[in-house]
């Protein structure tokens, strides 16, 4: 009896543990049986063809390689697809930046919020804030709120994000706090 390939599945060969950015990764397309035995393989991610070997190899995986992968095995009778297999890539915080709301120029007495934005997997588990003197600030949240903001808060700030993979730091972002008309009037 001839039949299309059966029990097609994606199997991770290496690494044996979780996948970190920069790792060498090999995925194997397995199937239990096929008749006829001569088969072809196809790999796809998000509907895009990636390769035609039984293995899909990444010399140095990147966060952009994460996603849903499927392999297809076909013979002269028909083709069978695997279930989608999710490739997760763990990486240290990257693309960090300090954003400022309502902007980077704020009048004294108002509120200013600095947010440490990043891309990380797993998510950032620890935030550290620094000022222009590289002094660590006593804030532990993703958002640093100053309310009311003072002229003395003017300066450059940067943040560091940490997860189980590693650390990343932002460039400096400058907050300018200007005097209110009332203060100028009193002077």
């Amino acid at each position: 009896v001839q039949y299309a390939p059966r029990d097609v599945r994606v199997r991770k060969i290496k690494p044996l543990s979780e996948i970190h950015s920069g790792n060498s990764v090999s995925l194997q397309c397995d199937f239990s049986s096929s008749h006829p035995k001569e088969v072809q393989f196809f790999w796809e991610k998000n509907g895009r063809l990636l390769g035609k070997e039984s293995q899909l190899n990444f010399d140095s995986i990147s966060p952009e390689d994460a996603g849903s992968y499927s392999c297809w095995v076909n013979n002269s009778i028909g083709q069978t697809a695997s279930k989608a297999w999710t490739l997760e890539v763990l990486y240290a915080p990257r693309r960090l930046r300090v954003s400022m709301s309502p902007g980077d120029q704020v009048m004294e007495g108002k509120s200013a919020t600095l947010t440490c934005e990043s891309d990380a997997n797993p998510p950032v588990s620890h935030y550290t804030w620094f000022d222009w003197n590289n002094q660590s600030l006593p804030y532990h949240s993703q958002k640093l709120r100053l309310e009311p903001v003072k002229v003395q808060h003017s300066g450059a700030y940067w943040c560091q994000g940490t997860n189980s993979v590693g650390k990343g730091r932002s460039p400096l972002s400058t907050l300018t706090v200007y005097y209110s008309p009332e203060t100028i009037g009193r002077r």
């Epitope: 998510p123 950032v124 588990s125 620890h126 935030y127 550290t128 003197n133 002094q135 660590s136 006593p138 804030y139 532990h140 949240s141 993703q142 958002k143 640093l144 709120r145 100053l146 309310e147 009311p148 903001v149 003072k150 808060h153």
Partner: antibody, heavy 120, light 109 residues
Framework: QVQLQQSGAELVRPGASVTLSCKAS????????MHWVKQTPVHGLEWIGA????????AYNQKFKGKAILTADKSSSTAYMDLRSLTSEDSAVYYC?????????????WGQGTLVTVSA | QAVVTQESALTTSPGETVTLTCRSS?????????ANWVQEKPDHLFTGLIG???NRAPGVPARFSGSLIGDKAALTITGAQTEDEAIYFC?????????FGGGTKLTVL
């Protein structure tokens, strides 16, 4: 008004674990860091660590890493502290305290404390 | 780890001015230590008074003020009242964690 209601006193055996809770009310829970402080007659007040309830990000005093684990449940506006592998040294009153920002941070509001006694 | 030292006890009279200080073994206390002052009354009732060296918390009476005096942080109560009898703790930010002082027991007689 702001209130931090802590769970009741605990008598626990050495080697065991305990979870303390701190239920916040009267403000938006995710807007402020929650800190935990230990008080003993010998060492006075000691800062354990802090959690950002919005993201779950934490910071710990090196002395308490591995001893305390801080978590927060946004749906119930409750912060938790797990204390593990308890010894007599962990017998203390533990406080949660809301960290306010203003122009500078301060330990604004405090819970009433939870007494933990570790004894065989 | 830095050790933060306070006077163990002080006594004052109603209407008098009293200053409590907070010293760090790590060196001079500066604005980068964000000195905090916390009041403890009987039954574990804690209240934050001062943050960032000299920022009085909302609702805290104006007679409480924070400053730096020499190489120490200071809490001054100008015109002490009987209800100010309490234990006062300072806390200093020490690069990546807070360190509390041992507390000053203030008696207002």
């Amino acid at each position: 008004q702001v209130q931090l209601q802590q769970s009741g006193a605990e008598l626990v055996r050495p080697g065991a674990s305990v979870t303390l809770s701190c239920k916040a009310s009267g403000y938006t829970f995710t807007d402020y860091e929650m800190h935990w402080v230990k008080q003993t007659p010998v060492h006075g007040l000691e800062w354990i660590g802090a959690i950002d309830p919005e993201t779950g990000a934490t910071a710990y005093n090196q002395k308490f890493k591995g001893k305390a684990i801080l978590t927060a449940d946004k749906s119930s506006s409750t912060a938790y502290m797990d204390l593990r592998s308890l010894t007599s040294e962990d017998s203390a009153v533990y406080y949660c305290t809301r960290y306010d920002y203003g122009s500078s941070p301060w330990f604004a509001y405090w819970g009433q404390g939870t007494l933990v006694t570790v004894s065989a | 780890q830095a050790v933060v030292t306070q006077e163990s006890a002080l006594t004052t009279s109603p209407g008098e001015t009293v200053t409590l200080t907070c010293r760090s073994s790590a060196g001079a206390v500066t604005t980068s230590n964000y000195a905090n002052w916390v009041q403890e009354k009987p039954d574990h009732l804690f209240t934050g008074l001062i943050g960032g060296t000299n920022n009085r918390a909302p609702g805290v009476p104006a007679r409480f003020s924070g400053s730096l005096i020499g190489d120490k942080a200071a809490l001054t109560i100008t015109g002490a009242q009987t209800e100010d009898e309490a234990i006062y703790f300072c806390a200093l930010w020490n690069s990546n964690h807070w360190v509390f002082g041992g507390g000053t027991k203030l008696t207002v007689l």
